[in-house]
Interface confidence: medium
């Protein structure tokens, strides 16, 4: 039993794919793609501004983080790095490059400098930065 | 232009993907996929034998790194976990399950505990562990 | 320039305080999480806590949990090290720095290190 077919228009093959697996994406070239979401990190240290221009330039976002169950590759990603969080200080919440709020009890807000702008660490931890920091950053691309 | 149509046989509609952009896979259901290869970490510690038996269950193999290029997202692993390296003692080397032999300067080997069994660290790195030791595990399966 | 000038190091018997002070100049020392460091002779650079920019959040190496107390006065530019039950082992030469070196790894500027010797 197969549960898709996957039409290879370059040579005009048909590969089956059995029920218990399946294609991810579709994602730029060489990004990770897990549960449907695209993931890119980027070596290069840029301050938030211009890591959101970077991954805007590759029809991308920063990282989102919206669910620890769908996104849990990210419990293991070592190191720190910009992701779309923004503090708004009139009300005080942190909230997405999208607009939407920051999900309760999803990251661990660390508050060791001052700032605007949060990097991510592992274990779903945002350590809050000031935003012209350079710093390496993560790309995300929701396909779904 | 397009380069690919994915047939969704569900629906049957076709997808148009960008030149840019690509499926990944076929992958196990939620695993990661990258390069088109598949990538799986498991929280729940085990021996090396029984990590991979785990693996083997999922017609897949321990981690077997082969490419500091097309597996760079093993750079930013964090935490130690069992790769598919063993330690020879009749010739001394070090291999993988499939029997190949682990490729010089691919893995900088960190002998802190003695050993025949090796665990994968951040930056490409292999500690020596005893095979009876519990850990977390990577299982990898090849798509191409 | 950036300047952390140290003071308040000596000889204390085991069991006994001393309080280390560290004071900032040259950058807008509420901006920034400052950290403790030590080395004892003979020895390695050791991690001994870090405070954040507000000095709400604190961490501790283990061996110094209940010990010792990292805090820090923005208005004076100035963060301290209480060290409470001294013991021979915790000879060193402590130095403070601007950065988080338990969270971030990067400590970017330091003092001249005073000299803390736990001697009966």
């Known amino acids: 039993i197969w549960s898709a077919v996957f039409l290879n228009s370059l040579f005009n093959q048909e590969v089956q794919i059995p029920l218990t697996e399946s294609y991810c994406g579709p994602c730029p070239k060489n990004w990770i793609c897990y549960k449907n979401n695209c993931y890119q990190f980027f070596d290069e240290s840029k301050n938030w501004y211009e890591s959101q221009a970077s991954c805007m330039s590759q029809n991308a976002s920063l990282l989102k983080v919206y669910s620890k169950e769908d996104q849990d590759l990210l419990k293991l990603v070592k190191s720190y790095h910009w992701m779309g969080l923004v503090h708004i200080p009139t009300n005080g919440s942190w909230q997405w490059e999208d607009g939407s709020i920051l999900s309760p009890n999803l990251l661990t807000i660390i508050e060791m400098q001052k700032g605007d702008c949060a990097l991510y660490a592992s274990s779903f931890k945002g350590y809050i930065e000031n935003c012209s920091t350079p710093n390496t950053y993560i790309c995300m691309q929701r396909t779904v | 232009i397009w380069s690919a149509v994915f047939l969704n046989s569900l629906f049957n509609q076709e997808v148009q993907i960008p030149l840019t952009e690509s499926y990944c896979g076929p992958c196990p259901k939620n695993w990661i996929c990258y390069k088109n290869n598949c990538y799986q970490f498991f929280d729940e510690s085990k021996n090396w034998y029984e990590s991979q038996a785990s693996c083997m269950s999922q017609n897949a193999s321990l981690l077997k790194v082969y490419s500091k290029e097309d597996q760079d997202l093993l750079k930013l692993v964090k935490s130690y976990h069992w790769m598919g390296l063993v330690h020879i003692p009749t010739n001394g080397s070090w291999q993988w399950e499939d029997g190949s032999i682990l490729s010089p300067n691919l893995l900088t080997i960190i002998e802190m505990q003695k050993g025949d069994c090796a665990l994968y660290a951040s930056s490409f790195k292999g500690y020596i562990e005893n095979c009876s030791t519990p850990n977390t595990y990577i299982c990898m399966q090849r798509t191409v | 320039q950036v300047q952390l000038v140290q003071s308040g190091g000596g000889l204390v018997q085991p069991g006994g305080s001393l309080r280390l002070s560290c004071a900032a100049s040259g950058f807008t020392f509420d901006d920034y999480a400052m950290s403790w460091v030590r080395q004892a002779p003979g020895k390695g650079l050791e991690w001994v806590s870090a405070?954040?920019?507000?000095?709400?959040?604190?961490y501790y190496a283990e061996s110094m949990k209940g010990r010792f107390t990292t805090s820090r006065d923005n208005a004076k530019n100035t963060l301290y090290l209480q060290m409470n039950s001294l013991k021979p082992e915790d000879t060193a030469l402590y130095y403070c720095?601007?950065?988080?070196?338990?969270?971030?790894?990067?400590?970017?500027?330091w003092g001249q290190g005073t000299q803390v010797t736990v001697s009966s």
């Open positions: 405070i954040s920019w507000s000095g709400r959040t604190t």
């Open positions: 720095a601007r950065g988080d070196v338990a969270i971030r790894g990067n400590l970017d500027a």
